[in-house]
Interface confidence: medium
Amino acid sequence: GITIPRNPGCPNSEDKNFPRTVMVNLNIHNRNTNTNPKRSSDYYNRSTSPWNLHRNEDPERYPSVIWEAKCRHLGCINADGNVDYHMNSVPIQQEILVLRREPPHCPNSFRLEKILVSVGCTCVTPIVHHVA
Amino acid sequence: GITIPRNPGCPNSEDKNFPRTVMVNLNIHNRNTNTNPKRSSDYYNRSTSPWNLHRNEDPERYPSVIWEAKCRHLGCINADGNVDYHMNSVPIQQEILVLRREPPHCPNSFRLEKILVSVGCTCVTPIVHHVA
């Protein structure tokens, strides 16, 4: 493998917890500018497993507002526009990294945290358990 | 909005870029322990809009490897197990925060970055454009 030399311009850390505590620049760089701007914004209504979006706010967290998907039905919408309970609407979940103020209310000290959010829903064939 | 008093025990910051550059504890806290442990891990195969996972690696990013969902078909799987092209499989995308080493190769200095990832796929009714 390539041996990466340590950059001589790196910040020095004399923190006894190093490298648990590091400096992070919050001037967020967005790498999405070249991606397809067509986002999944209307899929929640057009999906065969439609979902609603619920606002989750926490001022001690960055990002403070997270929108969570909740599937509208247990089943999926069929060609007639009715709910088919032989199929299941299930949330697609994703872990995301967030920053939590620690100690609370501190503007410049955070802890990385993993939280699980539901991004949308998909329609799946159910797992049927046959009883002998 | 509510004014949150500054905690007197906060670390002091004399950084001229404050509060752009902050201290972050990397001992990642997992808030998911009390959530339903049922993971969406097998949905990629059971969905009517199934997807495959593709590897994207960047050693200067955390997490370094991101597996992206790519829908297997343009259409959706119908009750007979065939692809129905009257419906569309579409990716559900979500922005996530990642950490990038900055300057490069520094083990204790990072920048937050937002990237768009495809988490899974859902089946939607197509938008039909009628030509007059």
């Epitope: 390539i2 490298p19 994703q94 | 990397l26 990629y44 996972l53 955390y62």
Partner: antibody, heavy 126, light 107 residues
Framework: EVQLVQSGAEVKKPGSSVKISCKAS????????ISWVRQAPGQGLEWMGG????????DYAQKFQGRVTITADESTTTAYMELSGLTSDDTAVYYC???????????????????WGQGTTVTVSS | EIVLTQSPDFQSVTPKEKVTITCRAS??????LHWYQQKPGQSPKLLIK???YSSSGVPSRFSGSGSGTDFTLTINGLEAEDAGTYYC?????????FGQGTKVGIK
Amino acid sequence: EVQLVQSGAEVKKPGSSVKISCKASGGSFTSYGISWVRQAPGQGLEWMGGITNFFGSTDYAQKFQGRVTITADESTTTAYMELSGLTSDDTAVYYCAREPNEFWNGYFATNDFDYWGQGTTVTVSS
Amino acid sequence: EIVLTQSPDFQSVTPKEKVTITCRASQNIGSELHWYQQKPGQSPKLLIKYASYSSSGVPSRFSGSGSGTDFTLTINGLEAEDAGTYYCHQSSCLPHTFGQGTKVGIK
């Protein structure tokens, strides 16, 4: 080709310490962590702890907490495991294993061990 | 910690036969279950990751299934070179834990 090459066999006295190295090549060192797993003679596999090379952060199994120290040197792409207070129960083959830091199917996963070192035999005997 | 229990402990099989090894977790681990093969005097080798994904270069006769608490490793058409000990491993919760191993012998 990914390779993990470990240091040679060690014979140690009870109460002493041992430090084993694991030199990684092929692939980017920061794209994975290194875990240490041991196997006593005729026994199964036991995870001791690991390090995430990207941050240098470590996790240890409670059984070894306070006795094991895992470090990594990014400049030489080498990980180290030091075990102190050795007893005869620590006689085992010690393996380093590569653990990718991945965002898998929607999760920040702790992972499979996709490549393993050849093993280092440590014998503790008076 | 999560306890993984494999069965059987030992299996003696004729070449070309199908081998099934099960691994049961003491609690739900989603799909974070991996399978390794270890031949005598060698390091373990990853066969299956995340319950059902084959590691690169692993013969197609090896497959994995299951989620939650019950998992299966299947060898469809055992070959002589498949003799060894098979371990399951969970990475859902720290500490990582392994099953006690299943030794597969050739008749």
